[in-house]
């Protein structure tokens, strides 16, 4: 399973749309601040 790649400090809004985000990756925290904290990898249903 590939988990989320946190090597980059920049994130792009998933829902904004290409003409609005203009492919830019903003230097900001993930939308849910706890996402950046170390945790056990999630197990998604499609992997079971």
């Amino acid at each position: 399973m590939e988990d989320f790649n946190m090597e980059s400090d920049s994130f792009e809004d998933f829902w904004k749309g290409e003409d609005l985000s203009n492919y830019s990756y903003s230097s900001t925290l993930p939308p849910f601040l706890l996402d950046a904290a170390p945790c056990e990898p999630e197990s998604l249903e499609i992997n079971k």
């Epitope: 790649n5 980059s8 792009e12 809004d13 998933f14 290409e18 609005l20 939308p31 706890l34 996402d35």
Partner: antibody
Amino acid sequence: QVQLVQSGAEVKKPGSSVKVSCKASGGTLSSYAISWVRQAPGQGPEWMGWINPNSGGTNYAQKFQGRVTMTRDTSISTAYMELSRLRPDDTAVYYCASGYCSRFNCKDYWGQGTLVTVSS
Amino acid sequence: QAVLTQPSSLSASPGASVSLTCTLRSGINVGAYRIYWYQQKPGSPPQFLLRYKSDSDKQQGSGVPSRFSGSRDASANAGILLISGLRSEDEADYYCAIWHSSAWVFGGGTQLTVLG
């Protein structure tokens, strides 16, 4: 684990309004858009619009302009979607969703869905 | 004509590779769009699998196995979701989506049945 938790099922009369809530449980909403997507029985998803939790700015799908209002209360990490002048064909499961992408991966979050039934 | 057209159903055997297509309406060039792919199982919300525009502009969903991959067929003006090593748990509905004219547009979906 971060989750989007939605309010419970609603049964509404035609012509009335419904307000669905979406709370970020275990995390804090940031500047990324929260979209609302509905899915009628046996149909594909239909995007209704999004709200920026930081600014409160909205972008509504043309189909729902004038009938939908998206708001948020950052103090309780909750977004709301209100749909007015309900019709029977508004019967659907309503989802909130958010997410972000790095250069290599994307992470999406969806609420569990809220069934809204419009019936006389 | 719909913006995005998907075959309504598809069936294949475990272990096989399947290609799910998402054809863009004439006049809308697939090369200009990121094609998003979602998997949905009964009673659950859609789950993002991946998005694909080109080999240099593609993102996988977090935790989504690499046997789910994207491509495009320029001659058919279509986006493609390739699932290799098909498993029984891949049986689901699959939807494509694009950001078009300042709105998210979803295809009608393909119901994938895993035989046996």
